[in-house]
Interface confidence: low
């Protein structure tokens, strides 16, 4: 009977970690000689298995090749890794007497595609916090997947974003691949509760994409609006000043009251009010004894937020000397306010 080496499958796909069978059957055992499996062709091809009874990790013959009438030379590769990808050939040799064995026929080859899951996407953002209206870039990386076809999408609060650039490396054929994508996000003051999500879909993920998440709270700074106001006096000789820092993030806030340029009180906020948009408010009360002041006094509220330059707001309170202007209040365009003591 004429010898024919048949590899019925042109290709097989296997998930990394699983096992696969590479089928090979012969129509005749003649001429006498070994059958060997190789990966690749030419002088650099790699011998995979030779049915010589040797132990090869992860590879076994499917049928008992020691039986005289066996014509099934299929092999099972277990715990497949991306490095096992390639074209496998089942090759029949004629046994040589003194010279080396001679290759007489090869099967058509079976390409093994190793399906390797992408790693969970990692989203990284800028090292420093950005401010509202600033454009910041986020990068998403995932590696170790195969085959090369992969889909990566960006979302912000459910809305899909268009990436600046997405690259899959290497560009040539390889055992596994990496993807990197960059997206640009314009920050806004409502982003403290927002998330940027990188979603990776791949054939190995069974319609359940992997997601990497960046909480914008880690990348945004919203500076406070600072206002100083004078409350109605609680008694004849007391003035209540209020410094209110509104809608700031993160929490890191230092507040200092100055009296005519001299530090009067350090206020370390403890009980911040949280707004629904994730930002914070803080109100500092400063009680001033008016009987100790006859001259005009400039009170300054100095707010340092997240190690940024201080925001200052002045408020002038008129002394007793301004008797004609008692009870009056003037607010100046630069947010300096003037009041008298009584």
């Amino acid at each position: 009977k004429e010898l024919k080496v048949t590899q019925p499958e042109k290709s097989v796909s296997v998930a990394a970690g699983d096992s696969t069978v590479l089928n090979c059957t012969l129509t005749s055992l003649l001429p006498v000689g070994p059958i060997r499996w190789y990966r690749g062709v030419g002088p650099s091809r790699l011998l995979i298995y030779s049915f010589a009874g040797e132990y090869v990790p992860r590879i076994r013959n499917v049928s008992d090749t020691t039986k005289r009438n066996n014509m099934d030379f299929s092999i099972r590769i277990s715990n497949v890794t991306p490095a096992d990808a390639g074209i496998y050939y089942c090759v029949k040799f004629q046994k040589g007497s003194s010279e080396p064995d001679t290759e007489i026929q090869s099967g058509g080859g079976t390409e093994v595609y190793v399906l390797a899951k992408p790693s969970p996407p990692e989203v990284s953002g800028p090292a420093d916090r950005g401010i509202p209206d600033q454009k910041v870039n986020f990068t998403c990386k995932s590696h170790g997947f195969s085959p090369r076809n992969i889909t990566l999408k960006w979302f912000k609060d459910g809305q899909e974003l268009h990436p600046l650039e997405t690259t899959v490396n290497p560009s040539g054929k390889n055992v596994s691949y990496n993807i990197s994508s960059t997206v640009r996000v314009v920050l806004n003051s409502m982003d403290v509760n927002s998330k940027v999500i990188c979603e990776v879909a791949h054939i190995t993920l069974d319609r359940s994409p992997l997601r990497g998440i960046a909480n914008l709270s880690n990348f945004i700074r919203v500076s406070p609006t600072v206002k100083v106001t004078q409350q109605s006096p609680t008694s004849m000789n007391q003035v209540n000043l209020t410094c209110r820092a509104e809608r700031f993030y993160p929490e890191d806030l230092q507040l200092i009251w100055l009296e005519n340029g001299n530090v009067s009180r350090n206020d370390t906020p403890k009980n911040l009010t949280k707004n629904t948009d994730g930002t914070y408010n803080y109100t500092s009360l400063f009680l001033v004894n008016s009987s100790a002041h006859r001259e005009d006094v400039v009170f300054t509220c100095q707010v340092k937020h997240d190690q940024q330059p201080a925001i200052t707001r002045n408020h002038t309170v008129l002394g007793f000397a301004h008797s004609s202007d008692q009870g009056s209040m003037q607010t100046f365009p630069d947010n300096n306010a003037t009041h008298n003591w009584n």
Partner: antibody, heavy 119, light 107 residues
Framework: QVQLQESGPGLVKPSQTLSLTCTVS??????????WSWIRQHPGKGLEWIGA???????YYNPSLKSRVTISVDTSKNQFSLKLSSVTAADTAVYYC???????????WGQGTTVTVSS | DIQMTQSPSSLSASVGDRVTITCQAS??????LNWYQQKPGKAPKLLIY???NLETGVPSRFSGSGSGTDFTFTISSLQPEDIATYYC?????????FGGGTKVEIK
């Protein structure tokens, strides 16, 4: 239809090693695509995941128990096993084994085996 | 570890009532959440996988919804055989963690 059956001693002395085996029937442990897990339930309490093994090697442990736990698989016997060393009374619980598909939940459970740690 | 907070810890309802159990994750777990039923002296039984998919053979009165951190499990019409403890379980991050359980009783 895959079925699971836990086996092992019901009483273990403190400081000794608890050893349990889960036998898989009605399917092959090496068919791929599944995790084989151990879960325990302290008396009157909730469920605690101990760890899982994928037949081809990867093993995952709960960090709270990692230093004391070993999970292994024997594909020839279609079994996987749990060893928990240096046990104390706090390890007294019902121990379950389960089959889990990553996106199909723990869909098959053993009936559970009660292990008491006492001298 | 991801903490799964289930509420209420127990409830009592009449046959035919609609019963709702919530489960809150300490971090975003997408839809990587399962729901189980455990009857006294028995092993848990999978009811819902991937937050909202009904396991084969489970009655349609059971349903699940939610994504991210907040999830809901519903029995649309409570039956006597539904007396059990119900657990949620996340598998987004190792280690897998379960909620504390909700014991459902009949009034």
């Amino acid at each position: 239809q895959v079925q699971l059956q836990e086996s092992g001693p019901g009483l273990v002395k403190p400081s000794q090693t608890l050893s349990l085996t889960c036998t898989v029937s009605g399917g092959s442990i090496s068919s791929g695509g599944y995790y084989w897990s151990w879960i325990r339930q302290h008396p009157g309490k909730g469920l605690e995941w101990i760890g899982a093994i994928y037949y081809s090697g990867p093993i995952y442990y709960n960090p709270s128990l990692k230093s004391r736990v070993t999970i292994s698989v024997d594909t020839s016997k279609n079994q996987f096993s749990l060893k928990l060393s240096s046990v104390t009374a706090a390890d007294t619980a019902v121990y379950y084994c389960s089959k889990e598909g990553y996106h199909s939940g723990m869909d098959v459970w053993g009936q559970g085996t009660t292990v008491t740690v006492s001298s | 570890d991801i903490q799964m907070t289930q509420s209420p810890s127990s409830l009592s309802a009449s046959v035919g009532d609609r019963v709702t159990i919530t489960c809150q994750a300490s971090d975003d777990i997408s839809d990587y959440l399962n729901w189980y039923q455990q009857k006294p002296g028995k092993a848990p039984k999978l009811l819902i996988y991937d937050a909202s998919n009904l396991e084969t053979g489970v009655p349609s009165r059971f349903s699940g919804s939610g994504s991210g951190t907040d999830f809901t499990f519903t029995i649309s019409s409570l039956q006597p055989e539904d007396i059990a403890t119900y657990y949620c379980q996340q598998f987004a991050y190792l280690p897998w963690t379960f909620g504390g359980g909700t014991k459902v009783e009949i009034k």
